[in-house]
Amino acid sequence: LVITPPGPELILNVSSTFVLTCSGSAPVVWERMSQELPQEMAKAQDNTFSSVLTLTNLTGLDTGEYFCTYNDSRGLEPDERKRLYIFVPDPTVGFLPNDAEELFIFLTEITEITIPCRVTDPQLVVTLHEKKGDIALPVPYDHQRGFSGIFEDRSYICKTTIGDREVDSDAYYVYRLQVSSINVSVNAVQTVVRQGENITLMCIVIGNEVVNFEWMYPRKESGRLVEPVTDFLLDMPYHIRSILHIPSAELEDSGTYTCNVTESVNDHQDEKAINITVVESGYVRLLGEVGALQFAELHRSRTLQVVFEAYPPPTVLWFKDNRTLGDSSAGEIALSTRNVSETRYVSELTLVRVKVAEAGHYTMRAFHEDAEVQLSFQLQINVPVRVLELSESHPDSGEQTVRCRGRGMPQPNIIWSACRDLKRCPRELPPMLLGNSSEEESQLETNVTYWEEEQEFEVVSTLRLQHVDRPLSVRCTLRNAVGQDMQEVIVVPHSLPFKEQKLISEEDLGGEQKLISEEDLHHHHHH
C-alpha cells in the first residue's frame, strides 16, 4: 500500500480542500472510525488499484486517524493497512468530542491506559488534571492519542489554551471493576442426574426492581406444571432468585430449561437457558487415548494423566504391578484426581525424580456403583546413554583394537568415526553409521546385553584395525532417544615409540577428519 502524501502525520488548514491517494495491488478503501468514506476508486491498466479521498471544507472535527486498507481485509497482515493522522488546527474546536466508551474507562487490573483527550493543533500545550484540580499531573502526552499512564480511580480533565482562552475537556472517569455482573444467570445444582434424583435450577436476576420469572421446561410442554419459588438474596446487591425444583426426575425431563425474566415496569426482558440430562444409570467413560507404552526419563519427574467423564463422582485407584498405589510419605509419588467440570475428571499420577524400579505395569481404575472403567499401560524408564569405557590395545596379532562400552535405555545405537590427518581434523566429526565395507582392514563386533535389574541395555563394541600407519583419532558415539555421549582415543602405529604417542599435541588434533570408510574398516554386528 502506498499513501500520497505519505504522512504519517499531516497538518492541514481549516476550510481548505485536500486530496489523499492510496494505491495497492488489490482494491483499496479509505476508512475513518471503522467507516468507509466517500471516495473515488479506480483501476489502472497495470492492474494497480487506487482510491482518491477528497477532504473538502476541512474543520477541526476532521482531525484524526485515517486508514487505507485492502477492500477485503480479512486475514490481512498489519502492514497491509496504512495509517495517516491529520491535524486541522481550528480555534473554534477545543478538544475533539468523545463518546461514552471513551469517557468512562473501566479496568479489571492495574494496567496502562490512555485518557484520550485530543486537540486539533499539535502545537498546543495540553495538561492533565484531576477534575476540579489545578495542579498538572506529570503524565506523557501524545497529540494523536492523549495521556498514557497508570491512573488511580479518579476523574480527570485535560486543559489547553487556545488564543487567550482556557479550554477544558470532558471529564474522564477511571474506575477499577471489582467484579463484572450480568442481569440474568441460570445455574443448576447439577446438569446431569440419574432418574429418580432431583433437578434443582436457580435463575438469578441482578439490579432490577420488579421482575417476573417464567420457566420453560420439558415437563411443562406435556402439561405437568411445577411451581417455582422466588426469594431475595439479601446478602447481595439486589439479587432476586427463582428456584425450579423437580423431584424424582424422569428420562423425559432431559432437555432445555429456560428462565425468562421480564422487568414489568419498563417491559425489559432477558432469558438464559441450561441443558439438563437425565440418565438411566451412572456412567464412567474414558476420554482420549493413552498409549499402551509410556516413557519416563530417569531422575526427571513425570506426570501421567487420564481424562474421563463420570456421573455420579467415582472412586479412583491407581495400581502398579497389581499393587495399590498411594501418595508416598517420601514424596516420590503423588496421586490427584480433579473435577475439571461437573462430570469431567482428570486423574494424575506424578512420579517425582523417577527411579529405575518405577518401571512396570500401571493401571488406573475409576468406578462407582453403576459402572467402572480401567486403563493400563507399561511404563518404560529411559536412561540417557553413557560411554563407560573407551580403550585401545595392541594384541600380539599385530592388529590394533579399540573397545567402547556404554549403557542406556532404550538400546543405544553406536557410531564409530575416525580421522587420519590429525593436523586438519575438524573438532566435530560428522557421524555416519559404518557399513558396506568389503576390505578386511578393520572389523567391528558389537554385543548388546539387557540388564534386568538395572533395566537398561549395555553395548560393547570392539573395533579391530588391521593397518595403522599414522596417528588416527577414533571416536565412539553412543546415542539413544534421550541423549548421546561420546569419547575419543588416539591410536598410533606400532612403529611410533610410547613417548611419541604421548607427545601428540592439541595442534595435531586439527586436520582432515573422516568417518571410518570402506577402505579403513569392516564391521559385523552380533545380536
Epitope: 461514552a100 469517557l103 472517569y173 474506575y175 463484572s180 455482573s181 439490579g207 426492581e209 439479601l234 447481595m236
Partner: antibody, heavy 127, light 107 residues
C-alpha cells in the same frame, strides 16, 4: 464552563401542558445520560425521568408515567421534558442534571451520580 | 420502589463538630448510593458517589461509608460553608430515589 440552563417553566392550569428545555454547553452532550429532578419548594428532591445517550432508553418515576415524556436533540445539545395532563402536585422547581451512567459493563449499569445541575425552572400548576 | 430513609431530619451543630448523617434503604442496593449538598435557592451538588468515592473538588472532610442497606455521611470537622441540606440518593436498575433530606443548621 460546563453548564446546564433550564427554561420553559411557568404557570399552567391543571390538565394543561408545558415543554421544559435544558440547554447544555461545555461538554459532549451526546455522550451522557441526562435526568430531570424536581423539588417542591421547601421539600425534598424527587427524581422524575432519565434517558440514555441516543434516546433508546427512557425511565420514569411511577407518578408521572404516561403524562411526562423525556426527549433530547443531540445536535442542538438540548434535553426536553414534555409535560401533559398537569396536576397541582406537579408544582415544583424542575432541574436538569447530567447523569453519570457509563456504558454497560457486562449487562450491568454502573452509576457515578448526577454531577452537573442546572439552576432550575419553576412550574406552577394552579387554577 | 426502593424507599430511602434519612436520619435525623434536622441536626444542629457547631463549627468543628463531627457530623454523621445516616441513610437506610428499604432493600439492599449494594453500594449504589450518592450524597448531595443543597443550599437554599441553589441546585444540589454531588459530594460522594458509589457510597464512598469522593467527587473531585469536594473537601476531604466529607466521607461516605456503608453498603447493602445502611449508609453514613460523615463531616469530620464542620465548617461554616457546610450548613446546608444533605440528601442521599440510590441508584438501582434504572430508577433513582432520594432520601427526604437532613438539614444541618447552626446550634
Amino acid at each position: 464552563q460546563v453548564q446546564l440552563v433550564e427554561s420553559g417553566g411557568g404557570l399552567v392550569q391543571p390538565g394543561g401542558s408545558l415543554r421544559l428545555s435544558c440547554a447544555a454547553s461545555g461538554f459532549t452532550f451526546s455522550s451522557y445520560w441526562m435526568s430531570w429532578v424536581r423539588q417542591v419548594p421547601g421539600k425534598g428532591l424527587e427524581w422524575v425521568a432519565n434517558m440514555n445517550q441516543d434516546g433508546t432508553e427512557k425511565y420514569y418515576v411511577d407518578s408521572v408515567k404516561g403524562r411526562l415524556t423525556i426527549s433530547r436533540e443531540n445536535v442542538k445539545n438540548s434535553l426536553y421534558l414534555q409535560m401533559n395532563g398537569l396536576r397541582a402536585e406537579d408544582t415544583a422547581v424542575y432541574y436538569c442534571a447530567r447523569d453519570l451512567v457509563p456504558p454497560r459493563q457486562g449487562d450491568y449499569y454502573y452509576y457515578f451520580g448526577m454531577d452537573v445541575w442546572g439552576h432550575g425552572t419553576m412550574v406552577t400548576v394552579s387554577s | 420502589a426502593i424507599q430511602m430513609t434519612q436520619s435525623p431530619s434536622t441536626l444542629s451543630a457547631s463549627v468543628g463538630d463531627i457530623v454523621t448523617i445516616t441513610c437506610r434503604a428499604s432493600q439492599s442496593i449494594s453500594d449504589w448510593l450518592a450524597w448531595y449538598q443543597q443550599k437554599p435557592g441553589k441546585a444540589p451538588k454531588l459530594l460522594i458517589f458509589k457510597a464512598s468515592s469522593l467527587e473531585s473538588g469536594v473537601p476531604s472532610r466529607f466521607s461516605g461509608s456503608g453498603s447493602g442497606t445502611d449508609f453514613t455521611l460523615t463531616i469530620s470537622s464542620l465548617q461554616p460553608d457546610d450548613f446546608a441540606t444533605y440528601y442521599c440518593q440510590q441508584y438501582n436498575s434504572y430508577s433513582r430515589t432520594f432520601g427526604q433530606g437532613t438539614k444541618v443548621d447552626i446550634k
